[in-house]
Amino acid sequence: KKVVLGKKGDTVELTCTASQKKSIQFHWKNSNQIKILGNQGSFLTKGPSKLNDRADSRRSLWDQGNFPLIIKNLKIEDSDTYICEVEDQKEEVQLLVFGLTANSDTHLLQGQSLTLTLESPPGSSPSVQCRSPRGKNIQGGKTLSVSQLELQDSGTWTCTVLQNQKKVEFKIDIVVLAFQKASSIVYKKEGEQVEFSFPLAFTVEKLTGSGELWWQAERASSSKSWITFDLKNKEVSVKRVTQDPKLQMGKKLPLHLTLPQALPQYAGSGNLTLALEAKTGKLHQEVNLVVMRATQLQKNLTCEVWGPTSPKLMLSLKLENKEAKVSKREKAVWVLNPEAGMWQCLLSDSGQVLLESNIKVLPTWSTPVQP
């Protein structure tokens, strides 16, 4: 008995060939011996089987002695043994229809689990192997699970179902809903305008939800909500914003926040959460603000940074075009009785300058000028 594998929703063509290369009488029946279709001369006739409105043949092939059964929009319950009767012969074809679906939505939040469920006909014992877009292979039976989805899992998953040494391939498009970056750091001099951007790593036609930015200032004992907003069809509208600082928010995606000026009291870490409509869970992006201030008070030139800096960062004070006078893995450095000239305060990581602030030290009889 010939075995044919089909995919739920697809079309399958079961072949039946007569030795005579001409149009003769034929019938396709199901295992209950109920007629699906056949011919009456050059006319196609259909029986009362459940396949009635989804079964067809190719009249153009009848003259060549070919009498296919075409089944459209396959269902799992179409799995059956189909019998073609032609020239006093019976040809049997076993059709096995499989379906593979993501048990939840195919749009999943980063960190969530993906479960792929195989629908299969009773009595079948298929094996499934899926390959993720980043090349990871997973194997299973009726269900396959992948926990902790990552951004790289977005894309087309290719799954192969194997049964009776035959295989059928499914492709499922998975979208992992996440921000492009899990975390970002913004380095700013005191007084500068700060731009926070939260680009999404996916595109969908309609995006609706709500979000909030919570901020933990380094100097504050507790975190506070800086802004709440709504997202409707990719349009952003602010619901509530603190008076200090008074953030501004862009009306379109990507989510964009502007802090009018960087001040030491704002330095710290924020967590932007985005709750999407019809999704359980939230998207998160951490954002950090590091603020630098260079000051000269009497005979003391000081450079300070506030905010989440890593211990390996180096803070230096140097006179322009000269070697650093002071370099420390600390958040404040100073020089007593600095020479006149343009001093640079540098925050660097392995030689790469992250933040720079210049201060002009005048001869001792003058007051300092900050450019």
Partner: antibody, heavy 120, light 107 residues
Framework: QVQLQESGPGLVKPSETLSLTCTVS????????WSWIRQPAGKGLEWIGR???????NYNPSLKSRVTMSVDTSKNQFSLKLSSVTAADTAVYYC??????????????WGQGTTVTVSS | DIQMTQSPSSLSASVGDRVTITCQAS??????LNWYQQKPGKAPKLLIF???TLETGVPSRFSGSGSGTYFTFTIRSLQPEDIATYYC?????????FGGGTKVEIK
Amino acid sequence: QVQLQESGPGLVKPSETLSLTCTVSGGSISSFYWSWIRQPAGKGLEWIGRIYTSGSTNYNPSLKSRVTMSVDTSKNQFSLKLSSVTAADTAVYYCARELEKRNYYGMDVWGQGTTVTVSS
Amino acid sequence: DIQMTQSPSSLSASVGDRVTITCQASHDISNYLNWYQQKPGKAPKLLIFDASTLETGVPSRFSGSGSGTYFTFTIRSLQPEDIATYYCQQYDSLPLTFGGGTKVEIK
């Protein structure tokens, strides 16, 4: 066991639409074809058409342009609408279940029938 | 559509008689034929399917035969409760069609 009960107006005016409902009790409506058959007084049986629980239909070509069938699985009901009726549509209307088994295809369960008269 | 022609349209026989009804199809319908019994004021009841197989609970005095285009229905020994109209119905192809019916009466 499964029982069928037709319901609907017994009198319909010419050119109007005849509407009948069949309620299935004692079993599930799912995974069967459900058909409508009519019988004018003193005459034979005419198959009007059938509907599967998925909503797919097959109608008798002689009535196709006037027939609409629908199914409501939540209520275990299926219905028939026949538009632009004339006196020739006066008949007893039956609903029935079509059953397929091995070497078997027949209407094994019938309603008791409801008489519909088309008259002004 | 497949036309089903039944004959006779009516017959009268005595209790205990053998009664035969014929049904002819306009096309070859293999053995895709049912026989129904309809008593006055009642819905039809399926007696025979697949041309010759008795439905469960149907008395063995009823039988069917035939294949292709010609079929017969027989009541071996007519009983008073057999007074009814008998219909053949093909299920080879849609639309499902019935014969015109044979009314069986007792003399």
